[in-house]
Amino acid sequence: GDLLIQKTIKKQVVLEEGTIAFKNWVKTGTEVYRQFWIFDVQNPQEVMMNSSNIQVKQRGPYTYRVRFLAKENVTQDAEDNTVSFLQPNGAIFEPSLSVGTEADNFTVLNLAVAAASHIYQNQFVQMILNSLINKSKSSMFQVRTLRELLWGYRDPFLSLVPYPVTTTVGLFYPYNNTADGVYKVFNGKDNISKVAIIDTYKGKRNLSYWESHCDMINGTDAASFPPFVEKSQVLQFFSSDICRSIYAVFESDVNLKGIPVYRFVLPSKAFASPVENPDNYCFCTEKIISKNCTSYGVLDISKCKEGRPVYISLPHFLYASPDVSEPIDGLNPNEEEHRTYLDIEPITGFTLQFAKRLQVNLLVKPSEKIQVLKNLKRNYIVPILWLNETGTIGDEKANMFRSQVTGKIN
């Protein structure tokens, strides 16, 4: 009996036309939502004038339906048993699942001012930037709508910066009508233990953002894993959102709509400093902001963002060192709300429920030559927003799963 089940599972999780896995893989049957909470700055003037702690108040959720588009350019390669594809991006605002509209206003860090002052360190260039910042009536902080902040707006300061520079700024700009990839993953035909594992991303096996093993593209995209998952496994996956591979470890058994699943979580160790977790040495890319690589819980992804000083963390700086959150008031990290987890059905390796949580932050530093940054006395890693991307298997799919997979085994 068991061998027959194993054989059936092995056949059905292969990523090729006609399998259960393939159908759900091409276009997810799960509704995926991305909720945003924006950190509204309450005291912009005090920060700019006196280098005060930044007081933030989170506002949200603002919810979008995402990942509803089918994979594109799906191409099988029989020679190396891989399938390549593009994952198109799309987001549809869901007013009924949101606290307000896309036209709601927020006081946030001026993304262009913070980025330009970081990218151009030369004092004479900074004098020019200062002139253009003042001329465009820009400041350290700005008021933007949700739609502008997420999906892009024409920045008045950047519009004055001489060619060639993009004048449109947004945390997720460009998003709609773009695609992530090309991904090339193993289809599992020759070796089921490699199914869904990424072979190449954008034609490469490495990212070119990090040194050593940190630069590797490991595991799957977390939507599924090779079948017959064990609790002792460390599940590796790659997330293009955070420009790195990461891992999850078993936490607990969970019953999801009558289906026994394993809950895997991203452990605090994955965010630790190299002092605590030596494996993380290559994620420490500079010595000043990281206080000689002793800070933890924030990831400098500037190399992946054309030099813009973007730092990724968990929401509310969960698992981050006290020095990171010290200049920010109004944060309340807690594991239940702010950690990332994957609920994996162990026989098939399918992720049936997940919550991916991350926070986008921007570094802003004092600058003698830029008037609006002149009074700052310290560096700030400023939280802009945090997001919660969730998906749960639908009732109909769960019934099918129970009858065809878990029911047969039990």
């Epitope: 151009y120 360190q121 030369n122 004479f124 260039v125 020019i128 253009l132 001329k135 519009s159 004055l160 910066v161 001489p162 060619y163 060639p164 520079v165």
Partner: nanobody, 118 residues
Framework: QVQLQESGGGLAQPGGSLRLSCAAS????????MSWYRQAPGKERELVAL????????DYADSVKGRFTIARDDAEKTVSLQMNSLKPEDTAVYYC???????????WGQGTQVTVSS
Amino acid sequence: QVQLQESGGGLAQPGGSLRLSCAASGFTVSTYAMSWYRQAPGKERELVALITSAGGITDYADSVKGRFTIARDDAEKTVSLQMNSLKPEDTAVYYCSAWRATLFKPYWGQGTQVTVSS
């Protein structure tokens, strides 16, 4: 290669005028922010005037506002600085500079000396 050559410096009386010119070669001035900086003895180099490629927007240091005018001639590939109502504190070496977003530091000319004295 990129070259900037200043001319027009010299000695002027207080209240007098001078016109500095900067000839550019090896690039198109219309796609750069063109600036004049100055450095007085024992002082830091400061930005005096700037003209951007985007709509020819100009900006001036507070100390020269209303007295100095920057202009660009794209056809002639020159940038000028008309300096009126000169003061002794305008005495400095004046440098022409070009910058755009692809550069981490500006291009510089050699500089031209301006002395305001009676």
